[in-house]
Every structure is written in structure tokens, then in C-alpha cells.
Amino acid sequence: MMTGTIETTGNISAKKGGSVILQCHLSSTMAQVTQVNWEQHDHSLLAIRNAELGWHIYPAFKDRVAPGPGLGLTLQSLTMNDTGEYFCTYHTYPDGTYRGRIFLEVLESSVAEHSARFQIPIEGRDYKDDDDKHHHHHH
């Protein structure tokens, strides 16, 4: 039974050329987190934190994505194309998969950054029908 909940930074805005921190936090479960994946709105993978090996920033983003703080992610040198949804996916044992959503709006103007921290409903899936199975590459 999946008892956990994910809190995220929710809907946030940041200035073009600036940086922003994406944060997710899993609570209310004793499940062991084996890895956390960060994914962009177009399903491109940004980063992963493996419990044993640590952080890996996917190479296409290595110059403008930084790990942390914590299990969060820092996006740098923001462009208008960075506007959109971001997802954190917690892979846990024995619970399975928890997923959180953040919406980032990148602003042209110098509007101050703001963030609303709130809880969102969890999306829980068992490993055996995890969507990541479909990410395998075949040759």
C-alpha cells in the first residue's frame, strides 16, 4: 500500500537568463528511495539521482543543470523554451513509483521569482507496469 505524498514547489516563475530551483519532497512513507528521476515537459530526461552512485546530469543539459539542493534540481541560464511542466519521479521499495509535477513559467520581464509550496496528489504505480519500461532502446 502506497502511503507517501509528494510535496513540490508547485507553480513557479523565474526570469529569463536566471536560475530556478525545482524541489520535490517525499513524505509519509518509510519506503527506501532507490532513485529519483527529473524529466522535462517534452519527456527529455534532465537528471537522475541514484541512491548508490549519486547524481547524473544527462549530457544534453550538463552545462546548465546542477544537482541539488537535496534531491532537487537547479536550472540555470533559463530560456523561454524552458517554460512548461517538470516531473520528479521517486522510485521506491517496496512502495513503487511516486511522481510530482512542477510548472515553471520563464518571464521576459523582471518580475520577481515566486513559488507556492503545496501538496499535489500522488501518482503511484507498481514497478511491473512502470512507464520507464518503454524507455529501453532497441537495436
Epitope: 532513485q35 530526461l45 537522475i48 539521482r49 541514484n50 544527462y58 549530457p59 550538463k62 524507455h135 537495436h139
Partner: antibody, heavy 126, light 109 residues
């Protein structure tokens, strides 16, 4: 301590098939790693041959032109390389290696080949 | 096909800093890895993902990457660092993975 040990014939006839095996100890062949083959012709550099994930997914060096096949035998905790239509250019020291990954579900997020066998010499000659 | 270019040889005196370069058109969007191979031995991973050092690798080994060039730096090279060094690159989707031609590092004892 993870160890890899290559085995196979030291001499192969031209146009024949080369079959090599890599025995894995200290780790499970079913764990989330890419199991890789690399070779080194005498006096030359390293050449990546290909790899297999525990799921059965494979990647190969395009230069092999479909001559190579990598497979896993979970019951024996080993993986193998078969190379067909062998020529003298395939003479080399063949290494097997373990490549770790960050994404244990999909095999993405390459950490690097952190454990290697000691290598086995294969000579192609009639 | 994708290629990585390294200088054939680099020489330094003990205690000096050795720099070995690796160039490749796709390196801005790929990671560089560095393997050390001493004579008659299997390769050893000394740097992964441009700049990360595996446990057990001395701190004098470091890596960096800028644009199409990756660099392995050995600060205060020692005689035991004499070896062939190979850069290696891959993207996260896996294919192709490729080695550079290798650089022979001589530490003039």
C-alpha cells in the same frame, strides 16, 4: 569484490567464428549494468565492440557490420561474444568489462566501465 | 562515424603537470571518460562524466570539458603515471560509444 574472467580459443581460423565467454563473480549478471566487450589489436588502441543489458538490450559498434552477437547466460552468471567471418584484422586482446549506470530501470545514465577482465589474446591464422 | 582525436604522445618531468586533450565535435553534448592503461594491463577508469573521479583514483587526476575539447590533467605527475590514456565518449542513449586513439604519457624519470 567484482571480478571478470575471459575465456575462449587463442587461435581462430580465417572466415571462422570467434566465441568468447566472460565469467562474472562478485556481482549478478542480472544486476543493472551493461556488460561490455572491448578489444585491442597488437600495438594499437582500444576499440569498443558492444554491450548487453540484463534486459537483453544490446548496442554494437557499427563498424562490425552485424558480425557480432552478445548474449547472457543467467544460469552460469556469464556473458558471451560471437564474432563471425573472422579475418586477420580481428587479431587482438579481447577484454570484457562491467559498465555501471545510474538509471537502474532503463540502463541510461552511463557511469563508465569500472571493472575489467585481464584480457584474452585471440590470434587469427590459418 | 563519430571520432575522438588525441595527441599521440605527451611528455613531462616528474612533479610537472601533464595535460592530455581529446577533441570531438559532439563533446559539448556528450560526456568524456578517461581510461589509463599501463603496459600489459587492462584499462582502469580514472575520470568519468567529464570531471568525476572514481574512488581509489588519486586526487592528482582531474578532468574538465569545454566546448569540443575534454582535458585530463595530472597535477604533479609521478613515474607510476606513465601509461597510455584513452578518452571515451558516449551519450545517454548508448550508441555509439567510442574510444579516442590514445595518448602515450611519458614521465621522464
Amino acid at each position: 569484490q567484482v571480478q571478470l574472467q575471459e575465456s575462449g580459443p587463442g587461435l581462430v581460423r580465417p572466415s571462422g567464428t570467434l566465441s568468447l565467454t566472460c565469467a562474472v563473480s562478485g556481482d549478478s549478471i542480472s544486476s543493472s549494468n551493461w556488460w561490455s566487450w572491448v578489444r585491442q589489436p597488437p600495438g594499437k588502441g582500444l576499440e569498443w565492440i558492444g554491450e548487453i543489458y540484463h534486459s537483453g538490450n544490446t548496442n554494437y559498434n557499427p563498424s562490425l557490420k552485424s558480425r557480432g552477437t552478445i548474449s547472457v547466460d543467467k544460469s552460469k552468471n556469464q556473458f558471451s561474444l560471437k564474432l563471425t567471418s573472422i579475418t586477420a584484422a580481428d587479431t587482438a586482446v579481447y577484454y570484457c568489462a562491467r559498465a555501471r549506470v545510474y538509471d537502474i530501470l532503463t540502463g541510461r545514465g552511463y557511469y563508465g566501465m569500472d571493472v575489467w577482465g585481464q584480457g584474452t589474446t585471440v590470434t587469427v591464422s590459418s | 562515424s563519430y571520432e575522438l582525436t588525441q595527441p599521440p604522445s605527451v611528455s613531462v618531468s616528474p612533479g610537472q603537470t601533464a595535460r592530455i586533450t581529446c577533441s570531438g565535435d559532439a563533446l559539448p553534448k556528450k560526456y568524456a571518460y578517461w581510461y589509463q592503461q599501463k603496459s600489459g594491463q587492462a584499462p582502469v577508469l580514472v575520470i568519468h562524466e567529464d570531471r568525476k573521479r572514481p574512488s581509489g583514483i588519486p586526487e592528482r587526476f582531474s578532468g574538465s570539458s569545454s566546448g569540443t575539447m575534454a582535458t585530463l590533467t595530472i597535477s604533479g605527475a609521478q613515474v607510476e603515471d606513465e601509461a597510455d590514456y584513452y578518452c571515451f565518449s558516449t551519450d545517454s542513449s548508448g550508441n555509439p560509444r567510442v574510444f579516442g586513439g590514445g595518448t602515450k604519457l611519458t614521465v621522464l624519470g
